[in-house]
């Protein structure tokens, strides 16, 4: 039995350019899209993803002393070089001389659970999203973003931290997942692949997208990141897939045009403030949501993931710039900085729209739709 397909509700249709580009058969995972040994699969494969800043990590005009016990950028594990069998490359961040932090890398030693035991947790991220198994949850209202349109001044810090490119956000960017679920944006960063190889962290029915943006938020119930780590709903990440489109994305160009300045691992530059919401899809009402973890050590759980149904379009040149400009330590490229998808282990992914109404060839047999856990909210 096949469920009727509703074109306008097709999961992950169309980029924020406004085109209707639902995942069609050509988007089904191919052999190349399936995890392979050289793709960063497996538990050890997290990128140095969430270089989560605490309040102290927001852009400072001058250095200031850190509060005792507060979580600093440097307090989180850093990434050491992965390798790709085809070419020397890496998505890596080497600790500064004298640092005694854990090192970790994609697809190699040490195993991530040894770096942080939480990486062996049962509710990890990223995951494969299967829209037909998602629970339609009408209680999931459109996301609300406030203060995301930043003026050009003050400038923002854009940094190659060795495992991603990260933009530190100033105070005042507020996001609500719903009533009483309020957050403050801290930073955003990207995940990408390499030439001809997609690099999103989340996948949709096994399909990996070219790249993915993460905007990391701290719950207003917590003053600092270290207090929120591991607490349910303490952190929230907005995630969107980046796809190839016909035109240059002017919002992304404001960041991508600056990557050459930070090609070297550990380097940073200042960029004019911009409209952060323009980096996200325009449709804030259609998304998938589940509880997971940071996708890098410390892999803390309790993170609320919101993955937009709509994708963002970048030109082929822009996607190439993203995947081919930055370097990790030594002579290794910063590429393929994504963690393999993790098992759901019984978790239900909720959808803010009826994503399961779909009769694609992927649903050849009857599917048991999950019910919305928050239906009574």
């Amino acid at each position: 039995q096949r469920l009727p397909r509703m074109q306008e509700d097709s999961p992950l249709g169309g980029g924020s350019s406004g085109e209707d580009d639902p995942l069609g058969e050509e988007d089904l995972p191919s052999e190349e899209d399936s995890p392979r040994e050289e793709d960063p699969p497996g538990e050890e494969d997290l990128p140095g993803e969430e270089d989560l800043p605490g309040e102290e990590d927001l852009p400072e005009v001058k250095p200031k002393s850190e509060e005792e016990g507060s979580l600093k950028l440097e307090d989180l594990p850093t990434v050491e070089a992965p390798g790709d069998p085809q070419e020397p490359q890496n998505n890596a961040h080497r600790d500064k001389e004298g640092d005694d932090q854990s090192h970790w890398r994609y697809g190699g030693d040490p195993p991530w659970p040894r770096v942080s035991p939480a990486c062996a947790g049962r509710f990890q991220s990223p995951v494969d999203i299967r829209p037909q198994l998602a629970a339609f949850c009408p209680a999931l209202r459109p996301l609300e973003l406030l203060g995301f349109q930043l003026p050009p001044l003050p400038e923002l810090r854009l940094r190659n931290n060795g495992h991603s490119v990260q933009l530190t956000l100033p105070p005042g960017l507020e996001m609500a997942l719903g009533p009483g679920r309020e957050y403050r944006a801290l930073q955003l960063h990207l995940h990408w692949g390499a030439a001809g190889r997609p690099g999103s962290e989340h996948t949709v029915e096994g399909h990996r997208f070219p790249a993915e943006i993460h905007v990391v938020h701290l719950s207003t119930a917590f003053a600092r990141v270290d207090e929120a780590l591991g607490r349910p709903g303490g952190l929230a990440v907005l995630a969107a897939f980046l796809e190839e489109g016909p035109e240059e994305n002017s919002a992304y160009e404001q960041l991508l045009s600056r990557l050459e300045e930070i090609a070297e691992e550990g380097s940073e530059t200042q960029v004019p403030g911009l409209d952060i919401s323009a980096l996200l899809p325009s449709d804030f009402s259609r998304y998938f949501q589940y509880e997971g973890s940071l996708t890098t050590p410390p892999c803390a759980q309790g993170v609320i993931w919101t993955v937009f149904n709509q994708t963002v379009m970048l030109s082929a040149k822009q996607l190439h710039t993203l995947s081919d400009t930055l370097w990790g330590p030594g002579d290794s490229r910063l590429q393929l900085n994504f963690r393999a998808t993790q098992p759901l282990n019984g978790r239900v992914i909720e959808a803010s729209f009826p994503a399961g109404v779909d009769s694609s060839p992927r649903a050849a047999e009857p599917v048991q739709l999950n019910s919305c856990l928050a239906a009574g909210d």
Partner: antibody
Framework: EVQLVESGGGLVQPGGSLRLSCAAS????????MHWVRQAPGKGLEWVAF??????????QYSASVKGRFTISRDDSKNSLYLQMNSLKIEDTAVYYC???????????????WGQGTTVTVSS | DIQMTQSPSSLSASVGDRVTINCHVS??????LSWYQQKPGEAPKLLIY???NLHTGVPSRFSGSGSGTGFTLTIRSLQPEDYATYYC?????????FGQGTKLEIK
């Protein structure tokens, strides 16, 4: 009175060098980003470079047309801005203006105080 | 780079006329646009910042409007001292770019 006074312009051969100076007065120089903007004879305005204030690390930014050839610098103790111009080309011929830009309290870069300009002529 | 296109390139008007100059921007710059006036042999002067804010000391006959990609400078009642060249400039991101200028001449 808020004032910017440029000096150092002149005639130079292609490939040569020149150093422009700008003396600022009447405002807290250290607070501001400072720019150089130029205007070729009979043409429009072209932004050349800026240098951030102390709070933002004094880091510079250049237009593509001068990057690698020109160097902007400042000396807050002397309330002075400089533009070192090397490998000069005929197309660098212009009036060069010292301009005050944004600062910590600004929302964006607008150029609210301009010097009178100094003329640079690159010719063989 | 963000491209700025002013129209018209030149115009003739009489004292007392209402004059409008347009500036089209190649991408959305919100309200981060300024207008400048330059007279021959002088440095430019800031008239309007943030699309519509009048700079200190600028006569109230000057006004600015617009946001996104389209902006307008209006001179309500032209005065003899207003004959000059006018430039728009984006302050969204560097390289900062100016329009090519609009020369306002006496009719």
């Amino acid at each position: 009175e808020v004032q910017l006074v440029e000096s150092g312009g002149g005639l130079v051969q292609p490939g040569g060098s020149l150093r422009l100076s700008c003396a600022a007065s009447g405002f807290t120089f250290t607070d501001y980003y400072m720019h150089w903007v130029r205007q070729a004879p009979g043409k429009g305005l072209e932004w050349v470079a800026f240098i951030r204030n102390k709070a933002s690390g004094y880091t510079p930014q250049y237009s593509a047309s001068v990057k690698g050839r020109f160097t902007i610098s400042r000396d807050d103790s002397k309330n002075s801005l400089y533009l070192q111009m090397n490998s000069l080309k005929i197309e660098d011929t212009a009036v060069y203006y010292c301009v005050r830009g944004g600062h910590a309290g600004s929302n964006y870069w607008y150029f609210d105080v301009w010097g009178q300009g100094t003329t640079v002529t690159v010719s063989s | 780079d963000i491209q700025m296109t002013q129209s018209p390139s030149s115009l003739s008007a009489s004292v007392g006329d209402r004059v409008t100059i347009n500036c089209h921007v190649s991408q959305n710059i919100n309200v981060w646009l300024s207008w400048y006036q330059q007279k021959p042999g002088e440095a430019p002067k800031l008239l309007i910042y943030q699309a519509s804010n009048l700079h200190t000391g600028v006569p109230s006959r000057f006004s600015g409007s617009g946001s996104g990609t389209g902006f307008t400078l209006t001179i309500r009642s032209l005065q003899p001292e207003d004959y000059a060249t006018y430039y728009c400039q984006q302050g969204q991101s560097y390289p900062f770019t100016f329009g090519q200028g609009t020369k306002l001449e006496i009719k």
